[in-house]
Interface confidence: low
Amino acid sequence: GVAPKAVLLLNPPWSTAFKGEKVALICSSISHSLAQGDTYWYHDEKLLKIKHDKIQITEPGNYQCKTRGSSLSDAVHVEFSPDWLILQALHPVFEGDNVILRCQGKDNKNTHQKVYYKDGKQLPNSYNLEKITVNSVSRDNSKYHCTAYRKFYILDIEVTSKPLNIQVQELFLHPVLRASSSTPIEGSPMTLTCETQLSPQRPDVQLQFSLFRDSQTLGLGWSRSPRLQIPAMWTEDSGSYWCEVETVTHSIKKRSLRSQIRVQRVPVSNVNLEIRPTGGQLIEGENMVLICSVAQGSGTVTFSWHKEGRVRSLGRKTQRSLLAELHVLTVKESDAGRYYCAADNVHSPILSTWIRVTVRIPVSHPVLTFRAPRAHTVVGDLLELHCESLRGSPPILYRFYHEDVTLGNSSAPSGGGASFNLSLTAEHSGNYSCDADNGLGAQHSHGVSLRVTVPVSRPVLTLRAPGAQAVVGDLLELHCESLRGSFPILYWFYHEDDTLGNISAHSGGGASFNLSLTTEHSGNYSCEADNGLGAQHSKVVTLNVTGTSRNRTGLT
């Protein structure tokens, strides 16, 4: 490697001395505290002498040295001033150091009221001090000087030193950001290194590093390592990269120049469409996954899925992967057909081959309907039970149920519905249902209630009185009854053509109507029964009511 720079030290350690004084220069090598062999000394870039590691000087100028084990040191400017007052700075001084300044008079005993200045402005709290400390100096062009009063017999004469430019050495070099590649391939790793060099005179100084893309901090922020490994680079990682180095005490911070990094893209190739379930045989209601993949391709890939006969794409996904999935939830019959997918990460999409998808339709909930000669089915009617699933791949087997009894089954080989016929009896009332099954799961219909009604038979009217002869004041009961017929039955009672009243019977035994007899109640009586399926009239019964006499006339 490159030999380390020699280090030039001063004794006494001030870079300015009075003319006539001597300053010792010591050449030190980092690899060995004392230089081995000859030391080359330079004054204002001219070889001064070849000697040991220490020389005495009395002349101003720029001094350098080098030894066998080290390269040429940085120049140190030593000033020998003829002035009465000088400002001295400790040497060496590095960026961020606190530097001691000393204002010295040739006759220092007779020098007093020393004041220190930076760029013409008095430094705070610097009055009448032998030495001051300037905190955290930087490599700027600040000029320092001091003033003092010199005793001259009985006079105090103000004197001013020459301006002093403190020789502040770089603690570490300006960083340079190095990337393992300035044009990485998308998805590939990259190493960024923030390179700098610490002054060999300050090996104990600890540095920390931070790397940036545009305004975003990379990694974990400040780190003792100058290196950052990025596992995978993407196009959005393209940009302006730079780094900062600072001492852990935050005293000195330096920033590198920006480096443009452009992430390169690998075009997609070998686009393949795969369908799950495998084979593209689906049952309606299942979820279909269309998996579009590429053999190669980097970065953000735009995947799209297409169906034959449809203008717009089924979906698009832009993501950083070689594979994307489109989920078609609960596929429908209309989802059957031919599909392809396309992938694009540059300019034009690459298409997959076509894949056919078939969709078998499970039966929908079937609907059970009754077909009968009239709205209110009656005993003897022929009832057709019709069960139909509006959707479902054939063949469909239909089963018919009355309550929980299976009445029979019927197949529909090419879809549609199926029928089952019943000749109704009074026992056929109740709940009917059907189910449909095409091998993809049976579906049950809602229950449908059927009421089979029985028309009323011709009623019989009976008159019941206390004695054989109806007499004024007797209580007469008229009883009307149909022996057959579905309830409720409405019974009507008549005297001649006048309606006496009606009574509804919800169970067997007929209905009765009571009359308190007067002479006007003589005449013909009849009744009628009706349950909504047609009224039936009884035969006429004649009643003769006698007056006050007790001998009774019989009922005819």
Epitope: G219, G221, H327
Partner: antibody, heavy 116, light 108 residues
């Protein structure tokens, strides 16, 4: 629909180790970073670390180095977090969360109770 | 690490009110802040990212604002379903993400 399904609650003894799983579905598992977050009794959320399912590379919060180990199984689209040498301090709800910088998708959480 | 401070652990509000939840970063995080809502027994749900962008499906009564070190989540016209814990999260220094301590929104 993106879903992260985590394993059920665990009661473990101090000093033991255990592994939580997070099964991903509804997206390409290897294309997104998976993070793990701890929520202790005090409700504070702490980021534990992340794993890149594509290559298994991990980054941990310094605090959880040596405490958590993150792995993935690409074939089952599942991320795992193993918690080592458990103490009562590790009793918490642990979440997996998808996202590079912020977390739009979270698992339902796994309650870990460390008790003798 | 960057510390995210949610100074108000609890906040009381009335239904229909407007409420602001604040979060302070210990250093400049630009606009790299997300907000989450968490209801008891549930996982956090993303509301806001990049300080002010509403995540898809989030009602527009949720608004995020702020940059640098001070961030605010505002809920206008508070609904009963908004009563939850709200967390902020910074993501400036990849990937050392940190969360705020949370602010619980309660009914007065």
């Amino acid at each position: 629909e993106v879903q992260l399904q985590q394993s059920g609650p665990e009661l473990v003894k101090p000093g033991a180790s255990m592994k939580i799983s997070c099964e991903a579905s509804g997206y390409s598992f290897t294309a997104y970073i998976m993070n793990w977050v701890k929520q202790s009794r005090g409700k504070n959320l702490e980021w534990i670390g992340l794993i890149n399912p594509y290559n298994g590379e991990t980054t941990y919060n310094q605090k959880f180095k040596g405490k958590a180990t993150l792995t993935v199984d690409q074939s089952s689209s599942t991320a795992y977090m193993e918690l080592l040498s458990l103490t009562s301090e590790d009793s918490a709800v642990y979440f997996c969360a998808r996202g590079l910088y912020w977390f739009p998708y979270w698992g339902q959480g796994t309650l870990v109770t460390v008790s003798a | 690490d960057i510390v995210m401070t949610q100074s108000q652990r609890f906040m009381s509000t009335s239904l229909g009110d407007r409420v602001s939840v604040t979060c302070k970063a210990s250093q400049n995080v630009i606009t790299n802040v997300a907000w989450y809502q968490q209801k008891p027994g549930q996982s956090p749900k993303a509301l806001i990212y990049s300080a002010s962008y509403r995540y898809s499906g989030v009602p527009d009564r949720f608004t995020g604002s702020g940059s640098g070190t001070d961030f605010t989540l505002t809920i206008s016209n508070v609904q009963s379903e908004d009563l939850a814990e709200y967390f902020c999260q910074q993501y400036t220094n990849y990937p050392m993400w940190t969360f705020g301590g949370g602010t619980r929104l309660e009914i007065k």
